[in-house]
Interface confidence: medium
């Protein structure tokens, strides 16, 4: 019969013969011959291969390093990578989440609209007319300025958005 | 020189409590966000809470969520954590940290106080 010039999926063509591929997790160590099967040896620890393959060699897992502010999110197998993602308060700088930068801080005048999480940063926004944020802080929000007449004071000095109101006493008139 | 120094830990049995305590100074307390973290034993460092400056603001993860509440006296450059419904797997050593400003992942780490969580 003619040598096949394509193969069924999960095998490949060599020396003009089908050959299985090697499954996930498992790494070619010799092609099938016309009397043998192909040989695959599982990846060693801290390796993997994620799909059916003729590599000779399996990939190494991800390290996750600490000192760029990275940790492990999911372990690696013979069949997955490890997954990395950042440290409380920081955050990826790409998809492949190879650093981690800090999460930056909102100024004051600013407040947190989303709070960081391991892939993005934290979201500020200004505060409106009658909020206030008066410190740099990657948790804090604007707040509202205190209301003086729900404590039966007035205002003596107007609110801005990095200070809150300053309440007084209500003037007495005199008789 | 900054120093944070955490207190109150101690062995307690599960569903307990207990309050951590943690005196900070030699920087501006007030203006500073502030976080626990813990190391269990034979693990990685864990994030417990968050707390904004002010106070106002305070986040928690999902697995302390609902039984440790954090909270701030500025008054007094004391940082807590109050911690309820204690289980065995709350054992761990406890830090006070004050959030990064640098590339540094902390500013600055108490030397932790261990709480453990045993009948």
């Known amino acids: 019969p003619e040598p096949p010039t394509a193969c069924r999926e999960k095998q490949y063509l060599i020396n003009s013969q089908c050959c299985s591929l090697c499954q996930p997790g498992q790494k070619l160590v010799s092609d099938c011959t016309e009397f043998t099967e192909t040989e695959c040896l599982p990846c060693g620890e801290s390796e993997f291969l994620d799909t059916w393959n003729r590599e000779t060699h399996c990939h190494q897992h991800k390290y996750c390093d600490p000192n760029l502010g990275l940790r492990v999110q999911q372990k690696g197998t013979s069949e997955t990578d490890t997954i990395c993602t950042c440290e409380e308060g920081w955050h990826c700088t790409s998809e492949a989440c190879e650093s981690c930068v800090l999460h930056r801080s909102c100024s004051p005048g600013f407040g947190v609209k989303q709070i960081a999480t391991g892939v993005s940063d934290t979201i500020c926004e200004p505060c409106p007319v009658g909020f206030f944020s008066n410190v740099s802080s990657a948790f804090e929000k604007c707040h509202p300025w205190t209301s003086c007449e729900t404590k039966d004071l007035v205002v003596q000095q107007a609110g801005t958005n990095k200070t809150d109101v300053v309440c007084g006493p209500q003037d007495r008139l005199r008789a | 020189e900054v120093q944070l120094l955490e207190s109150g830990g101690g062995l307690v049995q599960p569903g307990g409590s207990l309050r951590l305590s943690c005196a900070a100074s030699?920087?501006?307390?007030?203006?500073?966000?502030m976080k626990w973290v813990r190391q269990a034993p034979g693990k990685g460092l864990e994030w417990v809470s968050s707390?904004?400056?002010?106070?106002?603001?305070?986040y928690y993860a999902d697995s302390v969520k609902g039984r440790f509440t954090i909270s701030r006296d500025n008054s007094k450059n004391t940082l807590y954590l109050q911690m309820n419904s204690l289980r065995a797997e709350d054992t761990a050593v406890y830090y006070c940290?004050?959030?990064?400003?640098?590339?540094?992942?902390?500013?600055?780490w108490g030397q932790g106080t261990l709480v453990t969580v045993s009948s």
């Open positions: 707390i904004s400056p002010n106070g106002w603001d305070t």
């Open positions: 940290a004050k959030s990064p400003s640098s590339r540094l992942k902390f500013d600055y």
């Open positions: 030699g920087f501006t307390f007030g203006e500073s966000d």
